[in-house]
């Protein structure tokens, strides 16, 4: 499945939950905004909470997670709130207090991620060559660590997975993780013309110029992330099933399991030549900037059952379901998103004379 621009034969996939948001209203509130206390949470917006055992007493109102006030139905819900452990509430979370810049000042930076991608405004850069992945086809052994890290499912990758953004710009993969929504609610981090996809995969890489991640954090090009949108399709995705089939083993926050090695490249689109590129940040605290983002044009298809399993299997902080774990889109603040293909050109009659507002400045850098 490819995204709709430049695709005469490929309409937008029908399985994507959520509606387009042409006004980009979902960008208005962000997790840095405090919840509006005057609006009581709707019951259907409350994350599901594990039932307490009888000896713990009945569920009290103050035990329920607080929720961002009703607004855009695609807003991330406030999934972490008051911990059952009763410790302080300073930890970061989606959709509510504490404001992320209080948690980590870099979250108030000017060049944050994710962003809304508007293909018509992307700068076509012919110098952006197809990505090359080396060593991504892993043997079954040694096994890999799959973990519920509290806000996502994360697969730790061994050394040897190499990726180049261009000549002399080499990276090695560290880990991959996913972002998703809830039943009937999409949860990708990046959006396209305001459209949010059901889910998104991030494969995080470190520049070979750095030995350790903390050295690379905040340095321009220190980290690079390959991102792809996950959409609903008619068939089960066998590559993803190798991970999703283990989710029950890591339902509890902080739990982990071992899974056989797999072909990591099979989790990404087959077309690695058409993508968007921009410089942004990590999408969770510490929100370090200087991250090179590559967002593929082609989407990856999972079955409805697989997408449901992803959004329904894990538990996060405070025994609330781990759902809607995406950050709202951040302002570009003058950044130009580059495209490796002429994304601003549309084959439909109404766009016979596309306006290409931005030119390619970086030429692949």
């Amino acid at each position: 499945q490819r995204l709709p621009w430049m695709q005469e034969d490929s309409p937008l996939g029908g399985g994507s939950s959520g509606e387009d948001d042409p006004l980009h209203e979902e960008d208005l509130p962000s997790e840095e905004d405090p919840p509006r206390e005057e609006d009581p949470p709707r019951e259907e917006d409350l994350p599901e909470v594990k039932p307490k055992s009888e000896e713990e007493g009945s569920l009290k109102l103050e035990d329920l997670p607080t929720v961002e006030a009703p607004g855009d139905p695609q807003e991330p819900q406030n999934n972490a709130h008051r911990d059952k452990e009763g410790d302080n509430q300073r930890h970061w979370r989606y959709g509510g207090d504490p404001p992320w810049p209080q948690v980590s000042p870099a979250c108030a930076g000017r060049f944050q991620s994710p962003v809304d991608i508007r293909p018509q405004l992307a700068a076509f850069c012919p110098a952006l060559r197809p990505l090359e992945l080396l060593g991504f086809e892993l043997p079954l052994l040694p096994e890999l660590r799959l973990r519920n890290n509290g806000h996502s499912v994360q697969l730790t990758l061994p050394s040897g997975l190499e990726m180049a953004l261009g000549p002399g710009r080499e990276y090695r993969a560290l880990q991959l993780h996913l972002h998703w929504g809830a039943v009937g609610r999409p949860g990708s981090e990046h959006t396209v013309e305001g459209h949010r996809f059901p889910a998104e995969i991030h494969v995080v890489h470190i520049s070979t110029a750095y030995a350790r991640v903390e050295e690379a954090l905040g340095r321009p090009g220190g980290l690079a992330v390959l991102a792809a949108f996950l959409e609903e399709g008619p068939e089960e995705n066998s590559a993803y099933e190798q991970l999703l089939s283990h989710l029950e083993e890591i339902a509890e926050e902080g739990s982990e399991t071992q899974v056989p090695g797999l072909d990591v490249s099979a989790l990404l689109p087959s077309d690695l030549s058409r993508y968007f590129r921009y410089e942004g940040s990590l999408t969770t605290p510490p929100c370090a900037q200087g991250v090179i983002w590559t967002v593929f044009n082609q989407t990856v298809m999972l079955s409805a059952k697989q997408l449901h399993a992803l959004s329904d299997a894990l538990w996060g902080p405070g025994d609330s379901r781990l759902q809607l774990n995406f950050r709202v889109t951040q302002p570009l603040n003058g950044r130009v998103i580059e495209a490796s293909f002429p994304a601003g050109v549309d084959s439909s009659p109404r766009a016979a004379e596309p306006v290409q507002l931005n030119s390619c400045l970086a030429a692949g850098d």
Epitope: R90, V103, N149, H151, Q154, P286
Partner: nanobody, 133 residues
Framework: QVKLEESGGDLVQPGGSLRLSCAAS????????IGWFRQAPGKEREGVSC????????YYADSVKGRFTISRDNAKNMVYLQMNSLKPEDTAIYYC??????????????????????????WGQGTQVTVSS
């Protein structure tokens, strides 16, 4: 060289106090979750207390809540575990561990403290605490 090193373990009487120290060298703890873990003979390693340098959040296991306090000295790149009202069941080898915090590693301090195997980025060698009369 990148490492974590614990110190401060000792033999102490029940009801007594100890302060364990964890020194990080070769890297800064700024982007890390730091945890104190312990392993008693014949038992699984368990998370005692965890702290995030990123958002300041803390976690304490039920068995130590109200008795133990985790803290960090940014200038010295040290993490401490103040242990009061010690009990014989606190006897164990205490380990310090650090793992990247956020989407690159553990995203909550609870998740950090539930790491029962040395799968974190950095683990120390441990310091022995014995509570006995």
């Amino acid at each position: 060289q990148v490492k974590l090193e614990e110190s401060g373990g000792d033999l102490v009487q029940p009801g007594g106090s100890l302060r364990l120290s964890c020194a990080a060298s070769g890297f800064t703890l700024d982007y890390y979750a730091i945890g104190w873990f312990r392993q008693a003979p014949g038992k699984e390693r368990e998370g005692v207390s965890c702290f995030s340098s990123v958002d300041g959040s803390t976690y304490y296991a039920d068995s130590v809540k109200g008795r133990f306090t985790i803290s960090r000295d940014n200038a010295k790149n040290m993490v401490y575990l103040q242990m009061n009202s010690l009990k014989p069941e606190d006897t164990a080898i205490y380990y310090c561990a650090a793992e990247l915090y956020g989407e690159l590693g553990v995203a909550t301090v609870q998740a950090m403290c539930r790491l029962t195997t040395p799968g974190g980025d950095y683990w120390g060698q441990g310091t022995q605490v014995t509570v006995s009369s």
